[in-house]
């Protein structure tokens, strides 16, 4: 697995740098997770043929992943710094349950994909001390996540494969669109 | 060094199917991301659409349903194909590598080497 | 579809400073990029990423952005800068792109 974000050779050799920003943090986290995300569809796509499925096809799917739309603030017309960061971590806390489900998907790449998920929970808590209105995020239920992994992991072995696919491929674009809207803030 | 180098016939007739390919050296297709632009005689450039490292793809809406981009990583190429061309596509095609910060926002338009470009004429 | 503006043509002298700008909704959010072509030439990358300089470009040119307008200067113009100068951001939901209209840069 790539070394965290912080603990790379350019940190060691330069002790005396300054200690990254909040934003700085939240940036490098991201970028750490998009790099792990692209290489675990390395080995989903040399698996299987899903990475040739067209995002029309791909969108067929009763997955009800987390998407950034017009009313979350977080595009340049109508953004909204408070609503963005609320949509941004509603969205990766959806994210971790499908982030679990990924764990046993994975051969050669389990260490990656246990990174991915650690990741994104240090990310939550770097994007909760940013936010000042905590109480409108909505934490999901674990009932209904327990059930849901369930579910999904009683698939048969094509529908694992493209719901292993659209994660991954939905939390790339999630991010992207976190990333970009972050930059504005 | 990082070049790029379109290749495909200079000539295509109309309702055809136009089909490019940028070949690539200096770089790896799992690293960056390629795009497509193409500038017709006099115009202003228009971005026709690209292939990120993972292989996602993205379209310009208006060509959407002509347009396809794939790309072999192994040749170190990736091709375009536009479909039932007119005499309006007549235009420099340009294969470009898209930035490596690009691959985090999305920002796959955001490009930072370029091919020289090819004419490309539909006519009959 | 985002649309930019850009002033359609720009004079200055040899040796001083031009500002290009380009304007759009989009450009807060995405990056912006600066392209030259000179006459019956190729398109090549001045400026990517709002700011960065491809290596080969000269420190003379430089990319920033404020708000909803990015803003290519060429400081001590040169005979060689005049050409056209295209700006390009992102067209938003798709992560498709956009060009400017483009401006001739005419050196005196």
């Known amino acids: 697995a790539p070394v965290p974000p912080g603990e790379d050779s350019k940190d060691v050799a330069a002790p005396h740098r300054q200690p990254l920003t909040s934003s700085e943090r939240i940036d490098k986290q991201i970028r750490y997770i998009l790099d792990g995300i692209s290489a675990l569809r390395k080995e989903t796509c040399n698996k299987s043929n899903m990475c040739e499925s067209s995002k029309e096809a791909l969108a067929e799917n009763n997955l009800n992943l987390p998407k950034m739309a017009e009313k979350d603030g977080c595009f340049q017309s109508g953004f909204n710094e408070e609503t963005c960061l609320v949509k941004i971590i509603t969205g990766l806390l959806e994210f971790e349950v499908y982030l679990e489900y990924l764990q046993n998907r994975f051969e050669s790449s389990e260490e990656q994909a246990r990174a991915v998920q650690m990741s994104t929970k240090v990310l939550i808590q770097f994007l909760q001390k940013k936010a000042k209105n905590l109480d409108a995020i909505t934490t999901p239920d674990p009932t209904t996540n327990a059930s849901l992994l369930t579910k999904l992991q009683a698939q048969n072995q094509w529908l694992q494969d493209m719901t292993t696919h659209l994660i991954l491929r939905s939390f790339k674009e999630f991010l992207q669109s976190s990333l970009r809207a972050l930059r504005q803030m | 060094q990082v070049q790029l180098q379109e290749s495909g016939p200079s000539l295509v007739k109309p309702s055809q199917t136009l089909s490019l390919t940028c070949t690539v050296s200096g770089f790896s297709l799992t690293s960056y991301g390629v795009g497509w632009v193409r500038q017709a005689p006099g115009k202003t450039p228009e971005w026709l659409g690209g292939i990120d490292r993972d292989g996602d793809m993205s379209y310009n809406p208006a060509l959407k349903s002509r347009l396809s981009i794939t790309r072999d990583t192994s040749k170190s190429q990736v091709s375009l194909s536009l479909r039932s061309v007119a005499t309006e596509d007549t235009a420099v095609y340009y294969c470009?590598?898209?930035?490596?910060?690009?691959?985090?926002?999305?920002?796959?338009?955001?490009?930072?080497?370029w091919g020289r470009g090819l004419l490309v004429t539909v006519s009959s | 579809q985002a649309v930019l503006t850009q002033p359609s043509s720009v004079s200055k002298s040899l040796g001083q400073s031009v500002s290009i700008t380009c304007s759009g909704s989009n450009i807060g959010s995405s990056a912006v990029g600066w392209y030259q072509q000179l006459p019956g030439s190729g398109l090549k990358t001045i400026i990517y990423?709002?700011?960065s300089r491809p290596s080969g470009v000269p420190d003379r040119f430089s990319g920033s952005k404020s708000g909803n307008t990015a803003t290519l200067t060429i400081s001590s113009l040169q005979a060689e800068d005049e050409a056209d100068y295209y700006c390009?951001?992102?067209?938003?939901?798709?992560?498709?792109?956009?060009f400017g209209s483009g401006t001739r840069l005419t050196v005196l």
């Open positions: 990423s709002t700011s």
């Open positions: 470009a590598r898209s930035s490596y910060d690009s691959h985090y926002y999305g920002d796959y338009y955001d490009v930072d080497v």
């Open positions: 390009a951001t992102g067209d938003r939901g798709n992560y498709g792109g956009v």
